[in-house]
């Protein structure tokens, strides 16, 4: 029923839409474009089940993990799906279900002491020592499969650019920070702030990869210096 | 868990000071930006302020502009509203709220009067 | 301000009939990264809002399939296609695109 949707004490939350450039006090701001959303997380009521979206881990249950539902499917759509039973194949830890870990691409039953040692190995390669209570918790306190993260994907949060896949930089996105596409050829850049300048840029683009530099558009002539068009070019 | 949970709130004086508290756990709380949202007694809800992910950037609403003041400790993953000047139309329950894959607490319910 | 405008205030409508609500805003919520900021929740006395559909057409996670949303720019629509006795309420329409958040007056929805 509705009510049974609507009201559990399960709280789920929705995947990020991705918003646009803003402006700062004074002028018209744009909020982040998400919604407060009260959501519930298991149903057994709902006739019609719909798939629940996610971009990391940690969105859904203790016993799913965050992926592509079709392999090799679109990246920007993933949902909750169920986790890994003992034997079955896996990529990262949190696709096995609670009381087993992936290795050598199987999942496979945790013995404690063993396990324990490989978590703190795989929490300094991912994120480094800072990192260690990244969601909020210890991560090296609990045997959860959700403790471990993969390289967060487009859209998800992060707190530096070392969070994020490749092709991925940590941006300020209105008034938090996630994964975005590092600039391609031609694409529109932003020459950044020296720090200690004043506005609010609540909407930051990513720089440019590799090979390439965020310079004036040679082609773009404006009256104005500083209204030139900036891009990504080869060095 | 992914949970929000407001606390602080409670009938006060006109003219008094409030601080509500929103303790986060379960997500990585200073990568997001944070909101307050207030529903009045069978109003709709309205948007009260909202902070940055490393606190350095806020704004307000205007009926609260100057009076209140959101902050956020992301060492301890909680969320403040220091309310004070409280007047009889800031009686509300008041959600802290998460934004980009948003979620939001229970509520916590201030009541100003004399 | 964006200001949200919705209609009708109130609708009363026999269980296994349709209904629809509309709301209009006082500007375009499409943004340039394509999507449009328009939400729809419902809020039952006592409780927090139960949001059911964002950027206008899609039904966060387990919501039943009879609310849809529709519409662009600054014309939106929900509608439930066969109201049921738990679907009373007051249904309000949000746009997210610019601070402050604004909300639509609501609609009473209740059954004949």
């Known amino acids: 029923t509705l009510n049974s949707v609507l009201n559990s004490n399960a709280i789920k939350n929705l995947p990020p839409p991705l918003g646009g450039a803003a402006g700062h006090p004074g002028s018209a701001v744009s909020a982040a474009p998400g919604i407060l959303y009260p959501g519930g997380n298991k149903y057994q009521t709902i006739d019609n089940y719909q798939p629940y979206p996610c971009a990391e881990d940690e969105e859904c249950g203790t016993d799913e993990y965050c992926a592509s539902p079709t392999r090799g499917g679109d990246a920007g759509v993933q949902i909750c799906l169920a986790c890994r039973k003992r034997r079955k194949r896996c990529m990262r830890h949190a696709m096995c279900c609670p009381g087993n870990y992936c290795k050598n691409g199987i999942c496979v039953s945790s013995d404690q002491n063993h396990f324990r040692g490989e978590i703190e190995e795989t929490i300094t390669e991912s994120f480094g020592n800072d990192h260690s209570t990244l969601d909020g918790y210890s991560r090296r306190t609990t045997l959860s499969s959700k403790m471990y993260h993969t390289k967060g994907q487009e859209g998800s949060v992060c707190l530096r650019s070392s969070d994020c896949a490749s092709g991925l930089c940590c941006d300020r996105h209105f008034w938090s920070k996630i994964c975005k596409p590092v600039l391609k050829e031609g694409q529109v850049c932003t020459k950044h702030r020296r720090k200690g300048s004043h506005g609010l840029e609540i909407f930051q683009r990513c720089y440019c990869g590799e090979g390439l530099s965020c310079r004036i558009q040679k082609d773009h002539h404006q009256a104005s210096n500083s209204s030139r068009l900036h891009t990504c070019q080869r060095h | 868990q992914v949970q929000l949970v407001e606390s602080g709130g409670g009938v006060v004086q006109p003219g008094r000071s409030l601080r509500l508290s929103c303790a986060a756990s379960?997500?990585?709380?200073?990568?997001?930006?944070m909101h307050w949202v207030r529903q009045a007694p069978g109003k709709g809800l309205e948007w009260v302020a909202v902070?940055?992910?490393?606190?350095?950037?806020?704004y307000y609403a205007d009926s609260v502009k100057g009076r209140f003041t959101i902050s956020r400790d992301n060492a301890k993953n909680t969320l403040y509203l220091q309310m004070n000047s409280l007047r009889a139309e800031d009686t509300a329950v008041y959600y802290c709220?998460?934004?980009?894959?948003?979620?939001w607490g229970q509520g916590t319910l201030v009541t100003v009067s004399s | 301000d964006i200001v949200m405008t919705q209609t009708p205030l109130s609708l009363s409508v026999t269980p296994g009939q349709p209904a629809s609500i509309s709301c209009k805003s006082g500007?375009?919520?499409?943004?340039?990264?394509?999507?449009?900021?328009l939400y729809w929740y419902l809020q039952k006395p006592g409780q927090p809002p139960q949001f059911l559909i964002y950027?206008?057409?899609n039904r966060f996670s387990r919501v039943p399939d009879r609310f849809s949303g529709s519409g662009s720019g600054t014309d939106f629509t929900l509608k439930i296609s066969r109201v049921e006795a738990e679907d009373v309420g007051i249904y309000y329409c949000?746009?997210?695109?610019?601070?402050?958040?604004?909300f639509g007056q609501g609609t009473q929805v209740e059954i004949k």
């Open positions: 949000m746009q997210s695109i610019q601070l402050p958040w604004t």
């Open positions: 950027e206008v057409s």
């Open positions: 902070i940055s992910y490393d606190g350095n950037d806020k």
């Open positions: 500007q375009s919520l499409l943004h340039n990264d394509g999507k449009t900021y």
């Open positions: 709220a998460r934004e980009l894959r948003v979620l």
């Open positions: 379960g997500f990585t709380f200073s990568g997001y930006g």
